[in-house]
Interface confidence: low
């Protein structure tokens, strides 16, 4: 995850990243919108591998919790919003079928704008 | 991937998302910064699974290729930048060791700011 601060840059939205285990996650939403259970371990050729994910979300304690940094406030309302992406995970669906499915995880914090209507 | 446009919102940065196969990807960078080969298929209990990834990057054709949307240009220079996250993939390193490693993939397009110095 490239760090803009190192280049004297600021992010429009502050984010935090962490490693999340399947045990912490427990459930997730798959591509069809269904809730699935995320299995804690994945069988591999030499035993089992702990399943975990790198997640990034908006920092609720950050400066940008009220709105995005650097926005032209005369014309725009802004909000930092966590966005999601898909990663493959070993899961069990509601019918207890185990399989590899793409699940949604938090991967970024982006700024969304709505235009201010003339007062 | 929640679509801000549906809620009458605009993104500060325009992005494009696509499914990328390991065959298209060929290589990636792992967490230690080393280049690894991404294997096309993953062995699972009932055969093989094609390895692919959901990637999001800044739209090079979009309005925001010159800078971010909605920024207060009097005080800030801005740039839309593709950010990366880590996902687990079956890979082969330079010593031909096959294993599950976290690799970097493009997951978002965010806006970075640099403050304008007094003219």
């Amino acid at each position: 995850h490239s760090d803009p601060a190192r280049r004297g840059e600021l992010s429009v939205c502050d984010s935090i990243s962490e490693w999340v285990t399947a045990a912490d996650k427990k459930t997730a939403v798959d591509m069809s919108g269904g809730t699935v259970t995320v299995l804690e371990k994945v069988p591999v050729s030499k035993g089992q591998l702990k399943q975990y994910f790198y997640e990034t979300k908006c920092n609720p304690m950050g400066y940008t919790k009220e709105g995005c940094r650097g926005i032209d406030k005369r014309h725009w309302n802004s909000q930092c919003r966590t966005t999601q992406s898909y990663v493959r995970a070993l899961t069990m669906d509601s019918k207890k079928r185990i399989g590899w499915r793409f699940i949604r995880i938090d991967t970024s914090c982006v700024c969304t704008l709505t235009i201010k209507r003339g007062r | 991937h929640s679509d801000p446009a549906r809620r009458g919102e605009l993104s500060v940065c325009d992005s494009i998302s696509e499914w990328v196969t390991a065959a298209d990807k060929k290589t990636a960078v792992d967490m230690s910064g080393g280049t690894v080969t991404v294997l096309e298929k993953v062995p699972v209990s009932k055969g093989q699974l094609k390895q692919y990834f959901y990637e999001t990057k800044c739209n090079p054709m979009g309005y925001t290729k010159e800078g971010c949307r909605g920024i207060d240009k009097r005080h800030w220079n801005s740039q839309c930048r593709t950010t990366q996250s880590y996902v687990r993939a079956l890979t082969m390193d330079s010593k031909k060791r096959i294993g599950w490693r976290f690799i970097r993939i493009d997951t978002s397009c965010v806006c970075t700011l640099t403050i304008k110095r007094g003219r």
Epitope: K26, T27, T35, T37, M92, S94, K95, K96, R97 | -
Partner: antibody
Framework: DVQLVESGGGVVRPGESLRLSCAAS????????MSWVRQAPGEGLEWVSG??????????YYADSVKDRFTVSRDNSKNTPYLQIDSLRAEDTAVYYC????????????WGLGTLVTVSS | EIVLTQSPGTLSLSPGERATLNCRAS???????LAWYQQKPGQAPRLLIY???TRAAGIPARFSGSGSGTEFTLTISSLQSEDFAVYYC????????FGGGTKVEIK
């Protein structure tokens, strides 16, 4: 030994509500998913509802026929699953069984003796 | 919804005879996700077979299951007096559903 003992059945009028309980013992209750299956007099078995154990974050699931009126819940501290039935109808008259789901899938390796619910005006 | 049809509705046999119970699914059941239960009057159902052919713990070897796709069979090789009961099949490929049952009665 695994034991499941249902209670809470009885005679009720159409439109009323009822809450069934199932006292579970002999296994680590919180780890297992539980279901409710009913059997109308002289009829076959009908699965109505299930609830995940701790591994599944107590996700609930229902048969389409009862989705709007039945609510399944559980109290892991009391080793008890519950089935709340609202707006009871004559066709809900049945013996209601509490069943322990096998960890492999939604089939049932242990059953209670059932509790009879009779809906009559 | 997967509909299971059991046949025959009633099977009249003598102790020591072989019983063959059938269960047909309205569509193919993946990975043989089918179970069989026994139910005696006034009692709870008891799991006999799961995954179409695997005997549950404590179930005697005279009970066996077979089949795949849409056709499944429960066989009791030599009926004992305690085997006279109603037998249900259940699929768990989709949300669980049960067949209508086959009653095995003494001839």
């Amino acid at each position: 030994d695994v034991q499941l003992v249902e209670s809470g059945g009885g005679v009720v009028r159409p439109g009323e509500s009822l809450r069934l309980s199932c006292a579970a013992s002999g296994f680590t209750f919180s780890m297992y998913d539980m279901s409710w299956v009913r059997q109308a007099p002289g009829e076959g078995l009908e699965w109505v509802s299930g609830i995940r154990g701790s591994a599944g974050d107590a996700v609930t699931y229902y048969a389409d026929s009862v989705k709007d009126r039945f609510t399944v819940s559980r109290d892991n501290s009391k080793n008890t699953p519950y089935l709340q039935i609202d707006s009871l109808r004559a066709e809900d008259t049945a013996v209601y069984y509490c069943a322990k789901e096998n960890n492999r899938s939604i089939f049932f390796d242990y059953w209670g003796l059932g509790t009879l619910v009779t809906v009559s005006s | 919804e997967i509909v299971l049809t059991q046949s025959p509705g009633t099977l009249s046999l003598s102790p020591g005879e072989r019983a063959t119970l059938n269960c047909r699914a309205s569509r193919s059941i993946g990975s043989s996700y089918l179970a069989w239960y026994q139910q005696k009057p006034g009692q709870a159902p008891r799991l006999l077979i799961y995954d179409a052919s695997t005997r549950a713990a404590g179930i005697p070897a005279r009970f066996s299951g077979s089949g795949s796709g849409t056709e499944f069979t429960l066989t009791i090789s030599s009926l004992q007096s305690e085997d006279f009961a109603v037998y249900y099949c259940q699929q768990y490929d989709d949300w669980p559903s049960f067949g209508g049952g086959t009653k095995v009665e003494i001839k």
